[in-house]
């Protein structure tokens, strides 16, 4: 018996071939001997089966001795043995229809779980193997689960269902809702404008939700809500904003905030959360601000940084085009009685300059 695998919702074509290459009488029946369709001369006739409105054939092939049964919009319950009667012969074809669906939505938040459920006909024992967009393979039976979805899991999942040495392939598009970056750090000199950008890693036709930026300044004992906003059809509208600092927020995506100036009291880290409509959980992005200040007070030249710096960062003071006078893995360095000239304060990571501030020391007479 020939076995054909089909996909729920798809169309399948079961073949039936006569030895004579001409149009002769044929009938397709199901395992209960109920007629599905056949011919009367050059006319297609249909029987009382449940497939009535979804069954068809290709009249153009009859003259060649081919009498296919086409079943549209396949259902799991269409799984059956179909019999083609032609020239006093019976050709049997076993059709097995499978369906593979994502448990909930195909748009899932980063960190959530994806469950794929296989619908299969009674008596079948299929195996399923899925390949994620990042090349990870998962195997299972009726259900497959992936916990802690990552950004790289966004895209087309290819799942192969194997039954009776035959296979059928499913493609499921999964969108992982997340920010492009989990964390970012901005380095600024005191007084400079600060830009925070929160690009999303996905695009959807209509995006609605609400968000908030909480800020923990290094100098403050507790965190503070800097801004709350709504998102409707990708348009951002500010609901409430703190008066210090006076933030500005763009009304178009990607989410974008500006701080009029970087000040030591703003240095610290923030957490932007975005709750999307009809989704449980929130999207998060951490943002950090490091602020540098170089000052000269009497005979003391000082360079300081505020904010979340890693212990391996180096802070140094050097006279332009000369060796560093002082270089430490600390948040403040100073030089007593500095020579006249242009001094540079540098914050660097393994030789790469992250932040630079220049200060001119005038000669003392």
């Amino acid at each position: 018996k020939k076995v054909v695998l089909g996909k729920k919702g798809d169309t399948v074509e079961l073949t039936c071939t006569a030895s004579q290459k001409k149009s002769i009488q044929f009938h397709w029946k199901n395992s209960n001997q109920i007629k599905i369709l056949g011919n009367q001369g050059s006319f297609l006739t249909k029987g009382p089966s449940k497939l009535n409105d979804r069954a068809d054939s290709r009249r153009s092939l009859w003259d060649q001795g081919n009498f296919p049964l086409i079943i549209k919009n396949l259902k799991i319950e269409d799984s059956d043995t179909y019999i083609c009667e032609v020239e006093d012969q019976k050709e049997e074809v076993q059709l097995l229809v499978f369906g593979l669906t994502a448990n909930s939505d195909t748009h899932l938040l980063q960190g959530q779980s994806l469950t794929l459920t296989l619908e299969s006909p009674p008596g079948s024992s299929p195996s399923v193997q899925c390949r994620s967009p990042r090349g990870k393979n998962i195997q299972g039976g009726k259900t497959l689960s992936v916990s802690q979805l990552e950004l790289q899991d966004s895209g087309t999942w290819t799942c192969t269902v194997l039954q009776n040495q035959k296979k059928v392939e499913f493609k499921i598009d999964i969108v992982v809702l997340a920010f492009q970056k989990a964390s970012s750090i901005v380095y600024k000199k005191e007084g400079e404008q600060v830009e925070f950008s929160f690009p999303l890693a996905f695009t959807v036709e209509k995006l609605t939700g609400s968000g908030e930026l909480w800020w923990q300044a290094e100098r403050a004992s507790s965190s503070k809500s800097w801004i709350t906003f709504d998102l409707k059809n990708k348009e951002v509208s500010v609901k409430r904003v703190t008066q210090d600092p006076k933030l500005q927020m763009g009304k178009k995506l990607p989410l974008h905030l500006t701080l009029p100036q970087a000040l030591p009291q703003y240095a610290g880290s923030g957490n932007l959360t975005l709750a999307l409509e009809a989704k449980t959980g929130k999207l998060h992005q951490e943002v950090n601000l490091v602020v540098m200040r170089a000052t000269q007070l009497q005979k003391n030249l000082t360079c300081e940084v505020w904010g979340p710096t890693s212990p391996k960062l180096m802070l140094s003071l050097k006279l332009e085009n000369k060796e560093a006078k002082v270089s430490k893995r600390e948040k403040a360095v100073w030089v007593l009685n500095p020579e006249a000239g242009m001094w540079q304060c540098l914050l660097s990571d393994s030789g790469q300059v992250l932040l630079e501030s220049n200060i001119k020391v005038l000669p003392t007479w």
Epitope: Q193, K232, N233, E235, S237, Q248, G250, T258, P260
Partner: antibody
């Protein structure tokens, strides 16, 4: 073809009220952001007020906040500007303007209607 | 509100000249800026949107550049019909704000 036609301008005394209308056609009015922009005689352009297409939120320039109200009637494809407590400095040509689909500038403008506030 | 500072306020030039008008924002506004041309007694006309995109139907001699706080409108070769007043507009967020305008006159 997109068309914006303002009406309702005229002479009004200081402290008085006036309602401007802007009849829109040729685009999906209900989903488009719209604004009012004015120009005092011999002066530059000043953005006055806007209404969001997606959520109907309304926005105002500080100079008119609390005195002007922007609104729209989707069934009539009409944008309105209710102007109260009018002052001499509100004298201007008022334009209604349609924003591009993704809020990148005003791609269509009406011909303008003149509002004169004088005793 | 975000302030827009446009310069120069007036400019004299001849047909065929290359002309540059600048606009500076008090805050970073990404590329959310448009340039408009206005002729006496007429409504403004959009030339450039999103800082550098040419509006449909606008001659290619008009170009825009810039991002963040500093923006430029350039007319590569002035034509007689280009003598008008030009405005920049920030549409980064509400309230929108225009620059003071630049009047381009024939020398």
């Amino acid at each position: 073809e997109v068309q914006l036609l303002e009406s309702g301008g005229g002479l009004v005394q200081p402290g008085g009220s006036l309602r401007l209308s802007c009849a829109a056609s040729g685009f999906t009015f209900s989903t488009n952001a719209m604004s009012w922009v004015r120009q005092a005689p011999g002066k530059g352009l000043e953005w006055v007020s806007g209404i969001s297409g997606s959520n109907g939120n309304t926005y105002y320039a500080d100079s008119v906040k609390g005195r002007f109200i922007i609104s729209r009637d989707i069934s009539k494809n009409t944008l309105y500007l209710e102007m109260n407590s009018l002052r001499a400095e509100d004298t201007a040509v008022y334009y209604c303007a349609k924003e591009r689909d993704n809020w990148n500038g005003f791609d269509y403008w009406g011909q303008g209607t003149l509002v004169t506030v004088s005793s | 509100a975000i302030q827009m500072t446009q310069s120069p306020s007036s400019l004299s030039a001849s047909v065929g000249d290359r002309v540059t008008i600048t606009c500076r924002a008090s805050h970073v506004i990404r590329n959310d800026l448009g340039w408009y041309q206005q002729k006496p007694g007429k409504a403004p006309k959009l030339l450039i949107y999103a800082a550098s995109s040419l509006q449909s139907g606008v001659p290619s001699r008009f170009s825009g550049s810039g991002s963040g706080t500093d923006f430029t409108l350039t007319i590569s070769s002035l034509q007689p019909e280009d003598f008008a007043t030009y405005y920049c507009l920030q549409d980064y967020n509400y309230p929108y704000t225009f620059g003071q305008g630049t009047k381009l006159e024939i020398k």
